[in-house]
């Protein structure tokens, strides 16, 4: 088992909004849960966009999940990762 490296980034979207992206890379096996939480509960699936789980060329995998949020509410969002029985949560950077 190779645990993922998780990285959260933010980028400007439309006025007052940002897109937050959570990337997991260099993990094996390929089964992974990567999702955004808002206010500590699941963010609905229709407000998230997922990338495919793809090989990254080193025998490991990568994927991502993104959502668009209000800039001033970033504190309320965390990216949740679960892989091979391990869990972690990752805040949006300031």
């Amino acid at each position: 088992t190779v645990p993922p490296m998780v990285n959260v980034t933010r980028s400007e979207a439309s006025e007052g909004n940002i897109t937050v992206t959570c990337r997991a890379s260099s993990f094996y096996p390929r089964n992974i849960i990567l999702t955004w939480r808002q206010d500590g509960v699941s963010l609905s699936h229709d407000t998230q966009q997922w990338g495919d789980v793809l090989p990254d060329g080193n025998g490991t995998y990568q994927t991502w999940v993104a959502t668009r949020i209000c800039r001033g509410e970033a504190q309320r969002f965390t990216c949740y990762m679960e892989h091979s029985g391990n869990h972690s949560t990752h805040p949006v950077p300031s």
């Epitope: 509960v41 699941s42 949740y80 949560t89 805040p91």
Partner: antibody
């Protein structure tokens, strides 16, 4: 460490309002987190009532939505519960708690305060 | 709303025994589950979050598992301080709801 302490009257008459205070020490309620009220009925059933978060946004249990209000006083680092038109069914131990945004579980609770609704 | 059904409602066990408490959700909660222990006259205390993760300071004789709608809390070699009530709570969506509790008593 975050510490929470509930206070308020232990006896309320039916049809009146129940008002409780949660005083938070060790952390500013405007810095982060969701600040919650949870109650436990005499037969031990637990019910999440709602929260006010660090920015003042509230979220209530729909079963209580028409009767509940959660507010705060940031200068005193306190948040409040008001429940209107109470009945004997609102007799319970009321707890304040908080959760972080990594997940809505409750790491610490106040000691609880028993409120009896009775004429 | 997601309803949480706990079983058994109560159980009697001896010190040293292994006990298992189960919690069933009315819908898939995707491991968004916590467990609490409550002693008589005290506030609930967090034991487990994210379905399987032990909270800080929780002894390793406690373990939790599950997925989808079915979850369990296991206590190996029950100790005197483990007697009390146990509650599950989901945090998949609002409103947050709790199970009705399981009371663990001394046989």
């Amino acid at each position: 460490d975050v510490q929470l302490q509930e206070s308020g009257p232990g006896l309320v008459k039916p049809s009146q309002s129940l008002s409780l205070t949660c005083t938070v020490t060790g952390y500013s309620i405007t810095s982060d987190y969701a600040w919650n009220w949870i109650r436990q009925f005499p037969r031990n059933k637990l019910e999440w009532m709602g929260y006010i978060n660090y920015s003042g946004t509230t979220n209530y249990n729909p079963s209580l939505k028409s009767r509940i209000s959660i507010t705060r006083d940031t200068s005193k680092n306190q948040f409040f519960l008001q429940l209107i038109s109470v009945t004997t069914e609102d007799t319970a131990t009321y707890y304040c708690s908080y959760y972080r945004y990594d997940g809505a579980w409750f790491p610490y609770w106040g000691q609880g305060t028993l409120v009896t609704v009775s004429a | 709303d997601i309803q949480m059904t706990q079983s058994p409602a109560s159980l009697s066990a001896s010190v040293g025994e292994t006990v298992t408490i189960t919690c069933r959700a009315s819908g898939n909660i995707h491991n968004y589950l916590a467990w609490y222990q409550q002693k008589q006259g005290k506030s609930p205390q967090l034991l487990v979050y994210n379905a399987i993760m032990l909270a800080d300071g929780v002894p390793s004789r406690f373990s939790a598992s599950g997925s989808g709608t079915q979850y369990s809390l296991k206590i190996n070699s029950l100790q005197p301080e483990d007697f009390g009530s146990y509650y599950c709570q989901h945090f998949w969506s609002f409103p947050l709801t709790f199970g009705a509790g399981t009371k663990v008593e001394i046989k």
